[in-house]
């Protein structure tokens, strides 16, 4: 069985500012050298891919530049960033790891982030 | 990044016959076990043949006696041969891993695995 666990929080708010961390840790059954990490959004029954990144173990993740995510690795946990979000964004955000290189390949898949977002009040006019 | 492209898909009428291919770039041909799936509009995706690494294969009832899987293991593809196609044999037809290896359920690894475009096959008159 190909099977792997991936661990993920049940809940992060994000701050203020539209970013929101969480922690996405996997038990790799074997040596991977090569990893991919996705997270999925899920809402309403729809699933949309928010960012990817592959990454060599030992390295650090590489997003695309335009990407809403950052991330650092360390062994078999990623620590990601996801940044830029309204509240509009609120939903579960699920961690897909893959162990791409050597065979065998692997699959796991996270219960999901529940990452609830807040706009800012804006602030009042002040005569000053 | 998992790349499977699927092809060999078209128009054929009723007891016609297509040959459908699938070729992995990546690694994840090297699981035991690969699968035909199919979509047919309005309907769940369904696992119609898995064969494993060694060859030995399973197909669903509904294609049994008609459909053949087979594979390469040099070129990393995976075909299945369907003879006497029904109109119902109709859908969009995706080669991957067999879900249950992940230990997943079929809606799980449906709505999270990795998928490729998949082949449309149309069997009409």
């Known amino acids: 069985c190909k099977a792997m666990h991936v661990a993920q929080p049940a809940v992060v708010l994000a701050s203020s500012r539209g970013i929101a961390s969480f922690v996405c840790e996997y038990a790799s059954p074997g040596k991977a050298t090569e990893v991919r990490v996705t997270v999925l959004r899920q809402a309403d029954s729809q699933v949309t891919e928010v960012c990817a990144a592959t990454y060599m173990m030992g390295n650090e993740l590489t997003f695309l530049d335009d990407s809403i995510c950052t991330g650092t690795s360390s062994g078999n946990q990623v620590n990601l960033t996801i940044q830029g979000l309204r509240a509009m964004d609120t939903g579960l955000y699920i961690c897909k790891v893959e162990l791409m290189y050597p065979p065998p390949y692997y699959l796991g898949i996270g219960n999901g982030t529940q990452i609830y977002v807040i706009d800012p009040e804006p602030c009042p006019d002040s005569d000053f | 990044e998992v790349q499977l492209v699927e092809s060999g898909g078209g128009l054929v009428q009723p007891a016609g016959s297509l040959r459908l291919s699938c070729a992995d770039s990546g690694s994840i041909f090297s699981i035991n076990t690969m699968g035909w799936y199919r979509q047919a509009p309005g309907k769940q995706r369904e696992l119609v043949a898995t064969i494993t690494s060694s060859g030995s294969t399973n197909y669903a009832d509904s294609v049994k006696g008609r459909f053949t899987i087979s594979r390469d293991n040099a070129k990393n593809t995976v075909y299945l041969q369907m003879n006497s196609l029904k109109p119902e044999d109709t859908a969009v037809y995706y080669c991957?891993?067999?879900?249950?290896?992940?230990?997943?359920?079929?809606?799980?690894?449906?709505?999270?695995?990795?998928w490729g475009q998949g082949t449309q096959v149309t069997v009409s008159s």
């Open positions: 991957n891993a067999d879900y249950r290896d992940f230990g997943l359920s079929m809606e799980r690894f449906i709505d999270f695995g990795s």
